[in-house]
Every structure is written in C-alpha cells, then in structure tokens.
C-alpha cells in the first residue's frame, strides 16, 4: 500500500503480485465518518490507474475488475470528489504483474587456479518482472551441501567462496540453481563436476627465453605453472605477424625447446596450461613474453648493378649499386659491405668496407678486365659475394632489346615492354631494366634503380621510388655471358602540361641567321617527360598570328637556330615546352633585330 | 578470548521443532563462520550447517537439509541460530556450536575449528 490511508482502504484480490493474463479485483472503501461532509449520499469515489480515470461509483464503496496489466508494477488510486472542493486522495496500492521464473539453463561453475574459489554462472531465461531470488547450491562428498543466495535484481552470477582441493580429485560435486518468485520457482538441471573438470589453472608467469651461445637453432623457453598442470600449449609468431605457430606439450616442467625459430626476428611468446588430458579447461594465455632471437650469418647474395662512365683516354668511372639483403636473408644488423675489385689479368685486387651506403665509386684505368666482389656482413659472418665481370654494356648493338615503349599503369607504375634483339633472341640470358629521375647535365648522384627479368619476358612493371609527373630515363639490357647490349627510352606514371616554358637567355645572330640559347625547366616543374620545345616569333606591334618552330626535345639541348627572319625588323619570341598532356604557358620574351642583309 | 555459550535443546516428540542459539561473548563475532556440529552416543562429531561470517554462504548436511535452517544476527545480539523442524530420532545427540575463520570454505581440510561451545543436549523421543 502506499500514503497513510487515514480515510480508506484500497484492497486488491486475489493477490498485490499477479501473473501477467490474470484478473484482479480492486475494492476502494470508506472508512466511517469520512465521506463528504453532510452529503454523504454524494460521495463520488474514483479509481485512477496512474493518472488515468478508470472506474467511478457514488456511495462508501468502489468495485472495480481490472484485466490485461502489462509487465511490470501499475499504481492504483482511489480519490473522492465532494461538491465545491477538490478531489482528495484516499489511498492506494501498487500491482505487480510478473511471470514465475523459467528453468535456469547452461548452469556452469569453474575455479580459477588451485587457490582460487567456486564460482557458477547460468543464464537466467526471460525477465520475470518481479524480485526473483536466485539459490545456488553445491552439493560434495562427505554429504553436504553449500548454499549461497543471491539477492541483485539481475543474478546470473555467485562465487562461493569455497576452494575445492585436489586431495580427492575424483570426488564428485554437483551444483544446482533454484530461482523462487512470489509466482512460483524453477531449479536448474544439476551440473555435476570433479575438482580437475572446473579448475581452470591460473596462465602461466614467469616466462623467459633462453639461447646456449647465442645461436637460435639451440633455444629454451621457461615459464612456472601451479603444482598439478599436466599440459601446455605454446604459441608464438613474429612480432609483425597475425599467425600464430602452435606447439602442444606433455609433462614439460616448465621448459621446452623450440627449434624453427628465425634468427635476429623479434617473437611475441605465450603459453597456456590445463590439468588433465580431456578433462577441465585450458587457462588464459600468460602475459606475452616478447624477445629477439640472435643473428645469424646472412644467406642469400647481393643483387648488384653497375655504371660506366668515360672520364678521358686512359680512365673511366665505376658506380657499383646494390640491393639490401632482405630481413630474412640479412639474419641480422648488416655491419658492413665489402667490396672488392680485382683486375683479372693482372691480379691487383682492393678491398674496400662500405658502412651506412649502398654504392660505390671508384675510378679505373680503361684498359684490363676488370671483376668485382660485393658481400654483406653482419656480427656472425658475411654472405656469399656476388661477382660481375666489368663490361661495356651496351657495345653489342645486335643484342640492343627493340621496340622498347613505357607506358603509365597505374597510380606511381610504369610498365615497360620490349621485343627481343634480333640476333639470337636464345642468347639472351637475361634483361636488366633500369630506370633513374632525368636530370638534364646526367647528374651521377641520381639515385638508380633497376630490376631483373627472366630471358623469355618482354615486359616489366617498375614501381619502386615512381614518383608521378616526373620523367625516367629507362634503359632495357640485354645480358649475354660477357656482352651487353642497350635500349632507352623516357618515360613518366603520370603527367600534365609544364608549369612553365623554357627561359631564352641568349640570342645570337650567325651569318643571316639566329641561335636561340634556353635554360631548362626546372624539373619540378617538367610534370612529366618534355616531348617538344616550340619556339614562337612574330613582328613587334603585328597583331598576325605568329610563327612557331618545333623541336623535338633531347636530354642534351638547349640551343637552335632559325634562318627565316627579316633583316632589320624587330621580332619577339618565346617559347613553350609540351608534354603528353599538353604545353606550358609562355616562358620569357625576348626581343631581336637582325641586323644582316636581305636575301 | 572468545567464548561461545549454547542454549535451546531439550526433549521433543518427533515431528516436533526446536531452535537453538548460541551467542559469543567476544567482539569478534562478524569475522567468524559459524556451525553447528552433533555427536550422537557411540559416533564421530559430525557437521550439522554453518553460515559464514557475511551471513552470505551457508552449508548443511544432506541429512538435514530441508528441516534445518541456520541463520545469525550480527548486529546486535552476536548470536547464531539453528531453526530445526520435523524432527527425527535420529537427530538426538549434543549439539556444539562452534566459531572459525575458514569454517564453511575449508570443510574438507582438517582442524578449521577454532573455538567450541560445551554443547547442549536435543532428544527427540516419543
């Protein structure tokens, strides 16, 4: 009931807490002497369902049958009216509508470690509305029975508070949950469990690695477990891999050696553990265990490119280049590089260690055979060298790849293709495609970049340091034995019109005819590879269309003459640059008169 | 020093109800489970039920389970109760009380009683 009641009462039949579907009866009545003063004939009660006007009668007593209350708790109150005055409450009640529990289902209890405590857990069924009171009971040998009430509005969950031992492992225990509401009670099926069915061992700790002399084929990793763990599970992978390796173990005692692990990688590592062959639970993984596995002397060998480069009559300049060995073939922090380069006929060699570089320069006479020697080394040891033998790579012409074309693929690719040479395309032992940023002057600080492809392709997609409207000098070889023959071509992943034209910076007149002198265009503002220069005049003041010349673009030039201009009549001119794309804007102009005489 | 005094026990028909009490003279009553334990002419002291010290858990020997209800109040009287109904001839022996500090978690591990009450005797006889 709820307020005081002083004047009534409010009764509710059968029962305050009802099933959800069921009829009650609510009776709202007077008590004497408190109807309306001197018209007692005229008392109006008033029953409301929350705020809600449900029912009236006039006289000392209210008859009211409700059905179809929702779930959950509905307030009744029951108010008079008198003449002339306001309606004044006289009591109340709350109804609750529930359903009695469902059979609690999935009862399972587990124990966390050999010390820990008992604790199940169930799920509950539909809400029933109403306070339901959980009883968790668990029942051992020597006849008794624990029990332990649950009181939350929501229980699905009790811990115990008892530890079971292992004395008698075998010993049987069985656990039931009984919920109980005012509508009825339900008891789960009973869930019957030995000590090593529920034990769930605590994740091991403590774990560590170990590497007798520092050599990743003889590793021991070690951890602690409680007393009664029978199996472990081991799991580990490189730091930068989501796949896990797997390794089950019997009766380990804490240790096992682990025999496929990678040198100088760093492995995450966790172990977990379990009681009994088939019965009970594995544990939590440990905490990760993260530790570098030592290095090992590299496998594998460099993969090295070279440049010749005529200095003068008697000397040329070598640049050697070569790939980083890949993480699983460096086995470990490459040190140093060494380098050596032998003349062959005469047997003068020179060795060189290379440190924080992958390139190498050197100067050489240009007579002799010439071979190199290039090697990685890291604290264990040095890989296999690789060996060239220094030849003119692109003095055999019938060896030259034809038709070479670079094409853009793509976001930051170029594709490459090529026909076979026309001598004996079976010679050809394999391509080298090379590609480095077109700097005009061939500037050899460029870094270069190449690739290798079998004999039986005619194609290569490079992608590696394409950056888009910048143009590459491309170069196909062709490698047989000790001869080499070359193909180049320019070529962009993308491009637009040039941001400028070139800068005329001179303007000579040569026997009746000029020479046009530019600068380049700064290469950041090629946006591409330069196919053209165009070079535009007309007649100062003239409002004719003007003149255009255009020359198709080459690395090396930055001159051209023009013989088609008036003697003694001043012109203007300027010039663009094209690209696949499109032209730049007008560079600067310059004005020239010639000065020679009329044809 | 605590002290634990019994008192309810006495004859009854079966059928019949009893509730014993047993109250602890110390000020140290919420942190100890406590439990009833019987020994019957000529058998071992045997376990009844026990309640731990939060008034949370309580354990009962499958024998009375169902018939006997342990509870206690800890905040005022430090006392521990053992309502038992539909009483057996079998259920005739002294009954002690008892207080420890793992009574009810440590039932299967020996010497987890730290202190006992001198018993009071329950006869259940036509």
């Known amino acids: 009931k709820i307020d005081a009641c002083k004047r009534g009462d409010v009764t509710v039949k059968p029962s305050h807490v009802i099933l959800l579907g069921s009829t009650v009866n609510i009776t709202c009545s007077l008590k004497p002497r408190q109807g309306c003063f001197h018209y007692s004939r005229r008392n109006k009660l008033i029953l409301y369902k929350f705020d809600r006007r449900i029912n009236f009668h006039h006289g000392h007593s209210l008859n009211s049958q409700v059905t179809g209350l929702p779930l959950g708790t509905t307030l009744f109150v029951c108010k008079l009216a008198c003449i002339n005055s306001d309606e004044i409450q006289i009591c109340g009640a709350e109804i609750f509508v529930g359903v009695a529990p469902e059979q609690p289902q999935n009862l399972s209890c587990i124990q966390k470690g050999e010390q820990g405590t008992v604790a199940c857990t169930w799920e509950r069924g539909r809400d029933t509305h109403l306070y339901t009171e959980y009883t968790l009971q668990l029942s051992g040998p020597k006849n008794l029975t624990w029990q332990k009430q649950c009181k939350d509005i929501y229980c699905d969950y009790l811990d115990f508070g008892i530890n079971l031992t292992p004395e008698s492992p075998e010993s049987n225990f069985t656990a039931k949950v009984t919920a109980v509401n005012s509508l009825g009670s339900s008891s789960s099926l009973p869930s019957t469990f030995t000590f090593l069915d529920i034990v769930r061992p605590l994740p091991p700790w403590d774990i560590r690695i170990k590497f007798q002399k520092a050599s990743v084929s003889r590793c021991t990793l070690y951890w602690r477990d409680e007393g009664l763990v029978l199996l472990n599970r081991l799991r580990y992978r490189p730091s930068n891999s989501r796949l896990w390796n797997m390794v089950n173990v019997t009766k380990a005692k804490g240790r096992h050696d682990l025999l496929d692990l990678k040198p100088f990688t760093e492995y995450e590592f966790q172990i977990s553990s379990k009681l009994h062959l088939y019965k009970g639970s594995w544990s939590d993984w440990s905490e990760s265990l993260r530790a570098q596995t030592p290095e090992e002397e590299p496998t594998g060998m460099l993969d090295v490119w070279y440049m010749k480069r005529h200095i003068d009559y008697s000397r040329q300049q070598i640049s050697l280049f070569w790939k980083n060995l890949s993480v699983s073939e460096a086995r470990g922090k490459i040190l140093h590089y060494q380098v050596t380069l032998q003349e062959l006929t005469g047997g003068k060699a020179m060795t060189q260690n290379i440190t924080g570089h992958t390139s190498w320069t050197t100067v050489i006479p240009r007579t002799g055979n010439w071979a190199v020697a290039v090697s990685a080394a890291n604290s264990k040891g040095s890989s296999l060298p690789t060996r060239i033998n220094i030849m003119n790579l692109c003095e055999a012409g019938l060896l030259a790849p034809r038709q070479v074309s670079a094409n853009s693929e793509g976001m930051d690719n170029i594709l490459v293709t090529w026909q076979p040479p026309r001598k004996d395309p079976s010679a050809v032992q394999e391509y080298v495609v090379e590609w480095r940023e077109l700097h005009p002057g061939g500037d050899t600080q460029v870094p270069l970049n190449w690739l290798r492809s079998r004999p039986y392709n005619v194609s290569a997609l490079i992608s590696e340091n394409i950056k888009s409207y910048i143009c590459y000098e491309i170069r196909v070889y062709a490698l047989s034995g000790d001869q080499g023959g070359c193909s180049s071509i320019l070529g962009n992943s993308k491009h637009k019109a040039p941001l400028s034209g070139p800068h005329i910076n001179a303007i000579t007149e040569e026997k009746g005819s000029i020479l046009i002198s530019w600068n380049s265009i700064p290469v950041q503002e090629q946006m591409g590879c330069l196919l053209h220069y165009r070079i535009y005049w007309k007649e100062r003041d003239s409002n004719s269309q003007p003149q255009l010349c255009e020359i198709p673009y080459r690395v090396s030039q930055n001159s051209h003459p023009i013989n088609s201009l008036q003697p003694r009549v001043t012109y203007v001119l300027w010039m663009t640059a094209l690209t696949a794309a499109g032209e730049s804007s007008h560079g600067n102009e310059r004005e020239f008169c010639l000065q020679g005489k009329a044809n | 020093q605590v002290q634990l005094q019994e008192s309810g026990g006495g004859l009854v028909q079966p059928g019949g109800s009893l509730r014993l009490s047993c109250v602890e003279s110390?000020?140290?009553?919420?942190?100890?489970?406590m439990g009833w334990f019987r020994q019957a002419p000529g058998k071992e002291r045997e376990i009844v039920a026990a309640?731990?010290?939060?008034?949370?858990?309580?354990?009962y020997q499958d024998s009375v389970k169902g018939r006997f209800t342990i509870s206690r109040d800890n905040d005022a009287k430090n006392t521990v109760y053992l309502q038992m109904n539909s009483l057996k001839p079998e259920d005739t022996a002294v009954y002690y009380c008892a207080a420890g500090r793992s009574l009810i978690y440590n039932l299967y591990r020996a010497n987890n009683t730290d202190y006992w009450g001198q018993g009071t005797q329950v006869t259940v006889s036509s």
């Open positions: 309640i731990s010290a939060d008034g949370a858990t309580s354990i």
């Open positions: 110390g000020r140290t009553f919420t942190v100890y489970d």
